[in-house]
Interface confidence: low
């Protein structure tokens, strides 16, 4: 099991790393959209894990910028976000398309609705039960 | 950017609070890091207060140094103070990754003299 | 505590050189090391995370290695403004949190 765990931290961190570089190969990007939004999770550890990930940054700002799939619904009251972002968006997560072209990236401001807790945790509980 | 401040000479003994002013980022967002630096001397992790506002320090740190912070600052205090406390004391932003961390956004410092 | 110590502690290259700084760890930290570039009256400047990656705009003549307990940084085809003071960081917080500098390598370049 340990093993596995250790698979699949290194699996998330190439998916982190290389996200949103290649737009004809997105499966495993949206594969972890998925786990992100189901789990209500953000990164492998901690959001911040993103915040690294040259593809996601903005332009020389202090924003930083995490896939759309990190965002939590439930505590964004902001209706243009919802509307024009992020809603699109989760949608096509929620009804697990594989149509996307490119990876779908929502910035950070800096009070920011993203889930807190990192996906490790609740993916190690997931490989434990299972 | 980070801003340091409250660094000034003290007897030993003494109390101090250092503060840490942050702008352009949210401390909702992310940890801050204390680090400081004797003359002449190498960097020394002090202590870390992360996004939630839980607190860790380095063994030798805990006891006599508290971070805490607020909306916009972060406060490092200090008590029993010695002579060997006598350093610059930097604050730091930190970003993790993958269970490890790193500083990459720093303070200028502010120098805190401990003398009788 | 984890102990990180650095050696050499000074080392002198001519421009245009290669320079080696090694790091160990007292325990196993994985990959969970950063190197920092510090100069005189300068707060330390991030130069390599997670061991091996170098962030945006740092020089790919810095290239961090190794896991576990050992750990190298290296700098080739030197320049003067690579006269510095480097640190090695273990910063494990995937557990208990851990962290601590170890004592730095000047580099002098001739």
């Known amino acids: 099991r340990a093993q596995l765990e250790r698979s699949l931290r290194d699996v998330v961190e190439k998916t982190i790393q290389k996200y949103g570089t290649n737009p004809e190969e997105t499966a495993a990007e949206e594969s972890w959209d998925y786990v992100q939004f189901q789990l209500r999770c953000c990164g492998w550890h901690y959001p911040q894990d993103w915040f690294q990930v040259l593809i996601l940054r903005g332009n020389g700002s202090e924003a930083h910028r995490v896939p759309c799939s990190c965002y939590n619904l439930s505590a964004t009251n902001d209706s243009t976000i919802l509307d024009k972002v992020i809603l699109p968006q989760l949608s096509r997560l929620g009804h697990l398309a594989r149509s996307r072209h490119s990876a779908d990236i929502c910035a950070v401001p800096a009070e920011s609705h993203i889930y807190r807790e990192g996906c490790a945790q609740g993916l190690q509980k997931w490989l434990h039960n299972n | 950017s980070v801003e340091e401040s409250g660094g000034r000479l003290v007897t030993p003994g003494t109390p101090l609070t250092l503060t840490c002013t942050v702008s352009?980022?949210?401390?909702?967002?992310?940890?801050m890091g204390w680090v400081r630096q004797a003359p002449g001397k190498g960097l020394e992790w002090i202590g870390v207060?992360?996004?939630?506002?839980t607190t860790y320090y380095a063994t030798w740190a805990k006891g006599r140094f508290t971070c805490s912070k607020t909306s916009s600052t972060v406060e490092l205090k200090m008590t029993s103070l010695t002579t060997e406390d006598t350093a610059t004391y930097f604050c730091?932003?930190?970003?993790?990754?993958?269970?490890?961390?790193?500083?990459?956004?720093w303070g200028q410092g502010t120098l805190v003299t401990v003398s009788s | 505590d984890v102990v990180m110590t650095q050696t050499p502690a000074s080392v002198s290259e001519p421009v245009g050189g290669t320079v080696t700084i090694k790091c160990q760890a007292s325990q196993n930290i994985d990959s969970n090391l950063a190197w920092y570039q510090q100069k005189p009256g300068q707060p330390p400047k991030f130069l390599i995370y997670y061991a091996s990656n170098l962030p945006f705009g740092v020089s790919s003549r810095f290239k961090g290695s190794g896991s576990g307990t050992q750990f190298t940084l290296t700098i080739s085809d030197l320049e003067s403004a690579d006269a510095a003071t480097y640190y090695c960081q273990c910063a494990d917080v995937g557990s208990t949190y851990v962290a601590a500098f170890g004592g730095g390598t000047e580099v002098v370049v001739k």
């Open positions: 207060i992360d996004a939630s506002g």
């Open positions: 730091a932003r930190e970003l993790l990754y993958f269970g490890s961390s790193y500083y990459d956004l």
């Open positions: 352009g980022f949210s401390l909702s967002n992310y940890n």
